[in-house]
Amino acid sequence: TGADTEAVVCVGTACYTAHSGKLSAAEAQNHCNQNGGNLATVKSKEEAQHVQRVLAQLLRREAALTARMSKFWIGLQREKGKCLDPSLPLKGFSWVGGGEDTPYSNWHKELRNSCISKRCVSLLLDLSQPLLPSRLPKWSEGPCGSPGSPGSNIEGFVCKFSFKGMCRPLALGGPGQVTYTTPFQTTSSSLEAVPFASAANVACGEGDKDETQSHYFLCKEKAPDVFDWGSSGPLCVSPKYGCNFNNGGCHQDCFEGGDGSFLCGCRPGFRLLDDLVTCASRNPCSSSPCRGGATCVLGPHGKNYTCRCPQGYQLDSSQLDCVDVDECQDSPCAQECVNTPGGFRCECWVGYEPGGPGEGACQDVDECALGRSPCAQGCTNTDGSFHCSCEEGYVLAGEDGTQCQDVDECVGPGGPLCDSLCFNTQGSFHCGCLPGWVLAPNGVSCT
C-alpha cells in the first residue's frame, strides 16, 4: 500500500511527519525525498522526543495497526559491505541525509555483525504501552525490505524537513478557520510553528453564514532571520466578541474600545511587534539566559537573542551553554595534539622540535650539530634520532651507546693476533718477541 498521513510536529527549524504504510525503507525515503526531506534523524534525546510526539499523534488517528510491536523507518542505514563498528554509537550506520555521527543512540539490543546486505533502522513501538517521554522508542536494526515486502511489523515511517525558520501560528481574534499548507504538501489547522514558505488560508466567520471573509498569507523572511506572515492586527475580529474570543487573538493583553473595537497590548518589560499582536521582551538578554561564559547577543529589533561563545568554545545542544571545542579532532598538529580549555597545543615526538613550514609542524632535531653531539666520537643524524660510531680500534659502549671503548685486540674473539707477545694500546695494539727473538716484517711473527 502507499503512504497515508499523516501527523505533523514542527519545532525549532524542522518539521517531522509520521506516515502509516507498509513500505520498504527505500520507498519510504523516496516518499520523504519527493517533498524535500529525508527519513528522520534522531540525533539527540530532544529529537527522539519530537519524533515520539509525531508518532503518538499518528497513532491517535490510526484505528488499528496490525502488529502490537510496530516498526517505523527512520533515516539510519548501513550500506552493503560496510561492517559493524561496535565502538561507535551508531555502530557504523549513518544518516541518509548525511551529516556527522552523533553521540546519541538508543539500540534495542546488541547488534549482530553482518556485512553481506544493506541494513536499515526502524523505531520499535510497543503499542500495548502508552508512549511516555521517559520511554523513548528503541532502535531496531534489520533488513531494509523491498517493494511489496517491507519487512516484518513495518507499519510506517517518519520524515524530517528542515527550514530556514518558522512563523508563529496566525492569531484569530474572532471565529474563523486557518488552514496551513506546508512546502512538504501537508495541510493542517494546528501547528505550533509554521515552516518558512508555508501558505495560510484564513476563512473568517461562523462557517454557516455567507459573510465569510478570507485572507491569504505566506510565511516569509521579512528581514534576516525574522520570519513573519506580514499580517497586522488580529484576524477575523468581530465586535460581537471583542476580547472575549481567544483573547482577541492577542499574545498578552487585549483592550476593548466602547464601539466593539479592540487593541492588543503588552505587559511591562515587553513591547508590541509590527504584527500588532505579538509581544517581545524589551531586552531578552536581561534575564541572563546564557551560561558558562556565553555572551548574550541581541537579534535585530531586539526580538530575539543568541548566545555566543568565546574562541575555542562552542554552544552545546541547549544553545545556551559553552563547551570546549576539541580542536585535536581536526588533526591540526603534525605529530601530537593536546586539547586544552579553549584551545589546543601541538607537541613534537622525542627527536623532533617545533618548526618547519605550517602551523604545528615539527622538524628533526640535529643531535649531531656542533657543540650538541652526545657521541664521544662519530655522530650520524637520522630522522627523529641519531646514532654514534667509533673510530677503528674502538667499540660503542655505555648504556646509551654514546661512548667509545678501546678494543683489546690481544684478547680478541679470533684468538691471539700475535705469535708471541701482544701489547694493547689506545685504539690499537702491537706485537713483541721474547728475548732472543726478532719481530718479523709482518709485525706479527717472531724469528
Partner: antibody, heavy 118, light 112 residues
Framework: QVQLVQSGAEVVKSGASVKVSCKAS????????LNWVRQAPGQGLEWFGR????????DYNGKFKGRVTLIRDTSTSTVYMELTSLTSEDTAVYYC???????????WGQGTLVTVSS | DIVMTQSPLSLPVTPGEPASISCRFS???????????LYWYLQKPGQSPQLLIY???NLASGVPDRFSGSGSGTDFTLKISRVEAEDVGVYYC?????????FGGGTKLEIK
C-alpha cells in the same frame, strides 16, 4: 535570464499622482521581494518600499507612508508603484529592484524618470 | 533608522593604483547569526546601480576579484587592488539588516 523592465518616463503636475510598472521575467516572481528605490537628480539612493508578490505583503519607508501603494499582478508578473500628492521633491529616477536570498538587491530595472512640474 | 556615513565624497585615482572607500554605520550590522548585512553597489555613469559585494565580504557574480570588502560591526571598507578605467562611478554602501533599508551618501571614484 532575470529581467526587470519598467514603464517609460512620466511628466506629471504637482499634486497629481503617478503609476510606474515593473515587469519581471526569468525567475520565480512570487518568491522574491521586489523593492523600489529612487534617486533624485545628482543625489544618492533612497529605499521607499517593497512588495512580496506571493501574497501581496508590503512594507513602506515611514517617510512615504500614506502616499505610496505597491500592488502586484501575478498573472502578468508585474508590480505597480503608485505615488500620490506629488511635489517637485519627488522628481527622481525610480528603480524596481529584486531582493535575493542574501538580502542583496541583485537585479535592477532600467529606471523610470518621473518629473513633477509645477 | 540606521544612519551611515561614507567617505571620501570624491576619490581621484591613478589607473593601476589601489583605492579604498569607508563606510560607518550608526549601529552594528552584525546579526546574532554571525552574518554582517552590509552591501556595496556601483553605479556607473548613465546606468542603474549594480551589486558588487554582499554580506560584507562576498563578491557578487561576475565582479572582478580586484574588489574586496572587509570590516567590523560598524566600520567597513571597500578596496580595489588596482583601479581600472571601467571602475569609475559612484560607490554606495547599504544595510539590509533592519527596515527601512538605507544607503550611504556615495563616493565618486574618478580617474586622475
Amino acid at each position: 535570464q532575470v529581467q526587470l523592465v519598467q514603464s517609460g518616463a512620466e511628466v506629471v503636475k504637482s499634486g497629481a499622482s503617478v503609476k510606474v510598472s515593473c515587469k519581471a521575467s526569468g525567475y520565480a516572481f512570487s518568491s522574491y521581494w521586489l523593492n523600489w528605490v529612487r534617486q533624485a537628480p545628482g543625489q544618492g539612493l533612497e529605499w521607499f518600499g517593497r512588495i512580496y508578490p506571493g501574497d501581496g505583503d508590503t512594507d513602506y519607508n515611514g517617510k512615504f507612508k500614506g502616499r505610496v501603494t505597491l500592488i502586484r499582478d501575478t498573472s502578468t508578473s508585474t508590480v505597480y508603484m503608485e505615488l500620490t500628492s506629488l511635489t517637485s521633491e519627488d522628481t527622481a529616477v525610480y528603480y524596481c529592484v529584486r531582493g535575493d536570498g542574501y538580502w542583496a538587491m541583485d537585479y535592477w530595472g532600467q529606471g523610470t524618470l518621473v518629473t513633477v512640474s509645477s | 533608522d540606521i544612519v551611515m556615513t561614507q567617505s571620501p565624497l570624491s576619490l581621484p585615482v591613478t589607473p593601476g593604483e589601489p583605492a579604498s572607500i569607508s563606510c560607518r554605520f550608526s549601529q552594528s550590522l552584525l546579526h546574532s547569526n554571525g552574518i554582517t548585512y552590509l552591501y556595496w553597489y556601483l553605479q556607473k555613469p548613465g546606468q542603474s546601480p549594480q551589486l558588487l559585494i554582499y554580506q560584507m565580504s562576498n563578491l557578487a557574480s561576475g565582479v572582478p576579484d580586484r574588489f574586496s570588502g572587509s570590516g567590523s560591526g560598524t566600520d567597513f571598507t571597500l578596496k580595489i587592488s588596482r583601479v581600472e578605467a571601467e571602475d569609475v562611478g559612484v560607490y554606495y554602501c547599504a544595510q539590509n539588516l533592519e527596515l527601512p533599508w538605507t544607503f550611504g551618501g556615495g563616493t565618486k571614484l574618478e580617474i586622475k
